[in-house]
Amino acid sequence: NYANGKNNVPRLKLSYKEMLESNNVITFNGLANSSSYHTFLLDEERSRLYVGAKDHIFSFNLVNIKDFQKIVWPVSYTRRDECKWAGKDILKECANFIKVLEAYNQTHLYACGTGAFHPICTYIEVGHHPEDNIFKLQDSHFENGRGKSPYDPKLLTASLLIDGELYSGTAADFMGRDFAIFRTLGHHHPIRTEQHDSRWLNDPRFISAHLIPESDNPEDDKVYFFFRENAIDGEHSGKATHARIGQICKNDFGGHRSLVNKWTTFLKARLICSVPGPNGIDTHFDELQDVFLMNSKDPKNPIVYGVFTTSSNIFKGSAVCMYSMSDVRRVFLGPYAHRDGPNYQWVPYQGRVPYPRPGTCPSKTFGGFDSTKDLPDDVITFARSHPAMYNPVFPINNRPIMIKTDVNYQFTQIVVDRVDAEDGQYDVMFIGTDVGTVLKVVSVPKETWHDLEEILLEEMTVFREPTTISAMELSTKQQQLYIGSTAGVAQLPLHRCDIYGKACAECCLARDPYCAWDGSSCSRYFPTAKRRTRRQDIRNGDPLTHCSDLQHHDNHHGPSLEERIIYGVENSSTFLECSPKSQRALVYWQFQRRNEDRKEEIRMGDHIIRTEQGLLLRSLQKKDSGNYLCHAVEHGFMQTLLKVTLEVIDTEHLEELLHKDDDGDGSKIKEMSSSMTPSQKVWYRDFMQLINHPNLNTMDEFCEQVWKRDRKQRRQRPGHSQGSSNKWKHMQESKKGRNRRTHEFERAPRSV
């Protein structure tokens, strides 16, 4: 039973401190007068990450975000006062929170902010070439930001700028009630979704917008919006949220009479991300949080990755679902949702669908309609009253590719990298959470490439304090991940092969597609490198198959066994600490009696209790003396991490030792302690103290006493000897290690 549930835990769990110590994270901890580093724009060509925040826009160097330029773009005092008088929070709302940051042309960006509840936009000059090093605000040219940025900083905008036109899904009013999808800028009249019609949009929250070609003809290009919204009455009993994908044609210019300056090609469909329940009722993950499009060889068919959470406050869960654009298109070509019947329920529309089918882009490909203004009235009227599709879009394989329900966090962001490995291509997901951690997950095929299983490689804490990750970008060029939150921006490498260990088996067990054993170390795998020594097994992570011929090599180069001697007292308790770096590894203990070769597996019971951190031996007996071997077993591969020699001192012997007059010769103590290392002496002394303090019921209470005593001594004697200081340092490290999973990467015995 101990093994169950281990597959769902991250193999490695790295704290923020560990990330810093191992140089695996670079953080920009924000400015005192700014926050909300939520709006990202990655520019691989210039090697810059542009970040929109409160009253600021930053340009970070992709190589190292410590190197950055900034533009200060606050609101005027007048605007701020107006905002305050409107009853808004001066710090959290009455500022210019940047919500839109898009590449406008070769030399400029387009930026929009909330402007203290008075949306505003402008252009930012970035120059033609990276070496121009230009980053300045065009403060002579400000534009109205209505329909581009929300008024309220709590709301998001999904934006996309193509061919000089800005597509944005946002709230267009002060109250945050008039939500719409807009197209502004450019030479044409602004276009928007129908107003005050809940069939079109019902209190949506926009996530992102993407241009996806429909055919080889650019006239057929569509812009897809991802959002979540309230389910329309009759669609669901009670108040519910639905995740949606919406489409509009890039060449939609509105209708000629009806839907003038409104989208005529807008359609939306529900995105399902659910798991079947035991009682036949599915558990739905409806709160769409983020979307990532993984481009394929065919630009018409990217894979859509969506991050979802549950709506329920009782049951908290997160899921990742994958969708294919062919499935999306199939739904948009399917039946329209239509309200009919005595109960006014939503049913599939059975009547005649006008031609050209509503939602089809006017083009030469489909019937020669030159413009949406040319569409006949029946198409427009049908489009106006039937914006929703009846069928939902189901995920690939009809289920999520990853679910997390047993944790205290929820997913918020996702980026995906396609990695070439020895045995094929793997998609590595980096998932941001609402507690400031990033999960690194790889999709591995079980029997076939269609049936995927998720392997949680790492859980990394990237911010000092728990904070919601609100933005993520991945640079394939730099092989770096960039993460945004209210607190700041973090940067981390996509791969850190050296952390897995110094042996082939450890590299293989990691199952990281970025890494392979190169014959001497675990390093970045490059498919172009024609080296037969590359060992990698992402699919199975089986070191026995891939590293069996290197076992001798591993032992030679790999870790040497850590050995310890511990002294315990009869009838007292002692704790043998051993926790492998990998949380997937199962710990297996063996006991070898003194002067015996035979090793036996330790049976658990009242006398011996296994914990996550090691073995607790209660009520020690003389027969417990001997060697305790701690092995880590993972994927059939066993490695010995630690050998502890336990010496149990009988009570009589102890009494004799303790009652020796200090002035006496004390030879027995000297004899016993002469063979001990400084740290062992400390352990011995502490165990003596534990026995003499029956009030200290637990190891924790005992440690607390020891630490308090140490602090007191340090305060009283600032000039205490070097020897004493070293002793304590050693002891603190030993104790500290108990609660640590993956500290000290160089500590060989733990590196499984």
Partner: antibody
Framework: EVQLVESGGGLVQPGGSLRLSCAAS????????MSWVRQAPGKGLEWVST????????YYPDSVKDRFTISRDNSKNTLYLQMSSLRAEDTAVYYC??????????WGQGTTVTVSS | EIVLTQSPATLSLSPGERATLSCRAS??????LHWYQQKPGQAPRLLIK???QSISGIPARFSGSGSGTDFTLTITSLEPEDFAVYYC?????????FGGGTKLEIK
């Protein structure tokens, strides 16, 4: 001034074919949907066909579908109606009409088609 | 297809009187209804578009109302030249259909 002049009507035997033409002037022909509407002797109006601006698609009622074909030549400002497999019930005055996307705002004077043996 | 029913089939009134013509659709067509006038030996001409929108060159005494399924054409004070056949037509969906017509004759 908008003008629509139909031609090509006449007497034809059942099963026969006829091609009607409509010369348009006084407006930008290529900017409008065009339609044909007919009226049988002593009867009401019946919509026959509509073609979109580019000529790339046309609409028909079931009564004439697969027998009549509407077409246009925007370079010549001319609308056509090719009628085949004609029946006695196709006897009518055929009007060339501007519109069909919305209302039909201008009508020609009509051309008479008689199908009789 | 959408069927349009006009009533009455014949309406006999004197010049100067008010004429009210009705057109009922078999299903809701919004305001996608147009009215035409046809005099003997002439082509029809558009009077009202989209249920109530007037057409330039058409006298102000002609007005339209209604939406959904019930529509009305009103001629406030009949002139001698107004006596003709009036047709309604729906442009809501293909196939486009016309009503059977109302013949307005001099009493």
């Amino acid at each position: 001034e908008v003008q629509l002049v139909e031609s090509g009507g006449g007497l034809v035997q059942p099963g026969g074919s006829l091609r009607l033409s409509c010369a348009a002037s006084g407006f930008t022909f290529s900017s409008y949907y065009m339609s044909w509407v007919r009226q049988a002797p002593g009867k009401g109006l019946e919509w026959v066909s509509t073609i979109i601006k580019s000529g790339g698609y046309a609409y028909y009622p079931d009564s004439v579908k697969d027998r009549f074909t509407i077409s246009r030549d925007n370079s010549k400002n001319t609308l056509y109606l090719q009628m085949s497999s004609l029946r006695a019930e196709d006897t009518a005055v055929y009007y060339c009409v501007r519109g069909g996307q919305g209302a039909m705002d201008y009508w020609g004077q009509g051309t008479t088609v008689t199908v009789s043996s | 297809e959408i069927v349009l029913t006009q009533s009455p089939a014949t309406l006999s009134l004197s010049p100067g009187e008010r004429a009210t013509l009705s057109c009922r659709a078999s299903q809701s067509i919004g305001d996608y209804l147009h009215w035409y006038q046809q005099k003997p030996g002439q082509a029809p001409r558009l009077l009202i578009k989209y249920a109530s929108q007037s057409i330039s060159g058409i006298p102000a005494r002609f007005s339209g109302s209604g939406s959904g399924t019930d529509f009305t054409l009103t001629i406030t004070s009949l002139e001698p030249e107004d006596f003709a056949v009036y047709y309604c037509q729906q442009g809501y969906s293909f196939p486009y259909t016309f009503g059977g017509g109302t013949k307005l004759e001099i009493k």
